[in-house]
Interface confidence: low
């Protein structure tokens, strides 16, 4: 979790002088409770937005938006603490809106936004907005939380972000797998425009079962520049196991930007259709 870099963080708006500060996620009002505290945020909305850094990189960001309730408690509102919790790691990042002037009611409902929390593909977050000062220990809560899931790199808008492109999201290998005679598979895929090696991982399964009956790994050396975007054809020999007929082919690239952690692509070959007439049951059990 981090903030979008090199960006002037602004929270001022007409009628309000405001500054954005880093926060330890432990506001002073927890330690020194106040008697009068504001009510909670209203209509908290979290959306997936995309923002460029000054270097031109594109990142997914959490766009946080909320409004104030139209009650007298805004007279005691001194700011807000925005917290983003990454659920699988429990990592938390906070910022604080510090109001440098008193809020007054005006003809429109007060609305606040913040779009500088950088989020990761395929991660889940809990976003909380706390109005400050926080309530006394037994006081009514004055925060709102919402859960937010960032889609993975297969999502069209995500695909072109820097973190997704770094993991090879733009590479479409267009894998084809063909069953040949003599227990062989021909795997064909499109190479990317980088001189890096690939690995083909073959896993075979019995019909309708999920435990593998054959596994094989095939290394493909780095292509030369003239081979970029060309098709690579590989013939894999299968073990002659009766019923070991469903094959999953996975291609793992080793691009320089993601090394061992690049997006993998896969294709599956189903078992051939069973004949309508049942095969005679052998009078012995094959040992495999």
């Amino acid at each position: 979790l981090r903030l979008l870099d090199h960006r002037a963080l602004v929270c001022s708006q007409p009628g309000l002088n405001c500054t954005v500060k880093n926060s330890t996620c432990l506001d002073d009002s927890w330690i020194h409770p106040r008697n009068l505290t504001p009510s909670s945020p209203k209509d908290l909305q979290i959306q997936l937005h995309f923002a460029h850094t000054q270097q031109g990189d594109l990142f997914p960001v959490a766009h946080i938006e909320w409004t104030l309730q139209t009650d007298a408690s805004i007279l005691y509102l001194e700011g807000a603490e925005l917290s983003v919790l990454q659920l699988n790691t429990n990592e938390r990042l906070c910022v604080r809106f510090e109001f440098l002037s008193k809020l007054r009611h005006h003809h429109r409902r007060w609305r606040f936004t913040f779009s500088h929390f950088v989020v990761d593909p395929d991660q889940e977050y809990e976003v909380t907005v706390h109005h400050l000062p926080k309530p006394i220990p037994d006081g009514d809560p004055n925060h709102q939380s919402k859960n937010f899931l960032v889609p993975d790199c297969e999502h069209a808008r995500m695909k072109v972000t820097t973190p997704c492109m770094s993991s090879g999201s733009l590479w479409d290998p267009n894998i084809t797998v063909e069953t040949l005679e003599a227990h062989q598979l021909r795997v064909s895929f499109t190479l990317w425009n980088e001189s890096t090696h690939y690995q083909i991982l073959l896993t075979s399964f019995p019909h309708m079962e999920n435990h593998s009956c054959f596994e094989h790994m095939h290394h493909i050396p780095a292509p030369r520049p003239e081979e970029f975007h060309q098709r690579s054809n590989v013939t894999l020999t299968l073990r002659n196991l009766k019923g070991c007929c469903r094959h999953q082919v996975q291609i793992q690239p080793f691009f320089s930007s993601c090394l061992n952690d690049c997006l993998r692509h896969s294709a599956t070959v189903s078992c051939p259709e069973m004949p309508d007439t049942p095969e005679p049951i052998p009078d012995y059990m094959p040992l495999w």
């Epitope: 997936l48 766009h63 889940e124 859960n147 960032v150």
Partner: antibody, heavy 125, light 107 residues
Framework: QVQLQESGPGLVKPSETLPLTCTVS????????WSWIRQPAGKGLEWIGR???????IYNPSLKSRVTMSIDTSKNQFSLTLSSVTAADTAVYYC???????????????????WGQGTTVTVSS | DIQMTQSPSSLSASVGDRVTITCRAS??????LGWYQQKPGKAPKRLIY???SFQSGVPSRFSGSGSGTGFTLTISSLQPEDFATYYC?????????FGQGTKVEIK
């Protein structure tokens, strides 16, 4: 092994409010989303809405004006109230565990994998 | 809302038959689809999630396939305990919606 158990009145009068509670045992309510689904006799299934541990809710637009959900993590329970009931609300009501999240109108979730056995609710005077 | 259209609405089959149930979405839903089995008086039970992934403990004769708008649940060899109603559920868009169900009856 997570188990869900619905409880509530079997009979409710028209225009009254239906309260239902689902108790989660064998696991923590803090780890998933929790939903309600209903099924009128001989008919299909309708998703009512879901609640998360933080109290965030999403309701089916067709029922939104009448539905309220709440959660009590200390009791490992979540609840449904359906107001202004009519005979059309007569159904078996199920609670279920659901694992999903939202993002900018894109909803990524993985369906309901654990269900309660259901409780029959009849709306009649 | 996304409409899920299941076909057929009912079918009669014999033990040992291969049964195929289809579900069509009114718009693309990637592979965000599950298949559920419901017996009279019981809660639905999930068989397949993510269009083709097996729910643990479900017999391997059940399989799912499809992506986008067309999906299929196949029972390779119908067993006596498989006579039930089957529903598809899309969980790609809010709100989640079920198909109207396919009742599998004994011929």
């Amino acid at each position: 092994q997570v188990q869900l158990q619905e409880s509530g009145p079997g009979l409710v009068k028209p225009s009254e409010t239906l309260p239902l509670t689902c108790t989660v045992s064998g696991g923590s309510i803090r780890s998933y989303y929790w939903s309600w689904i209903r099924q009128p006799a001989g008919k299909g299934l309708e998703w009512i809405g879901r609640i998360y541990r933080s109290g965030n809710t999403i309701y089916n637009p067709s029922l939104k004006s009448r539905v309220t959900m709440s959660i009590d993590t200390s009791k490992n329970q979540f609840s449904l109230t359906l107001s202004s009931v009519t005979a059309a609300d007569t159904a078996v009501y199920y609670c279920a565990r659901e694992n999903y999240s939202e993002s900018s109108g894109l909803y990524y979730y993985y369906g309901m994998d654990v269900w309660g056995q259901g409780t029959t609710v009849t709306v009649s005077s | 809302d996304i409409q899920m259209t299941q076909s057929p609405s009912s079918l009669s089959a014999s033990v040992g038959d291969r049964v195929t149930i289809t579900c069509r979405a009114s718009q693309g839903i990637r592979n965000d689809l599950g298949w559920y089995q419901q017996k009279p008086g019981k809660a639905p039970k999930r068989l397949i999630y993510a269009a083709s992934s097996f729910q643990s403990g479900v017999p391997s004769r059940f399989s799912g396939s499809g992506s986008g708008t067309g999906f299929t649940l196949t029972i390779s060899s119908l067993q006596p305990e498989d006579f039930a109603t089957y529903y598809c559920l899309q969980h790609n868009s809010y709100p989640p919606t079920f198909g109207q169900g396919t009742k599998v009856e004994i011929k």
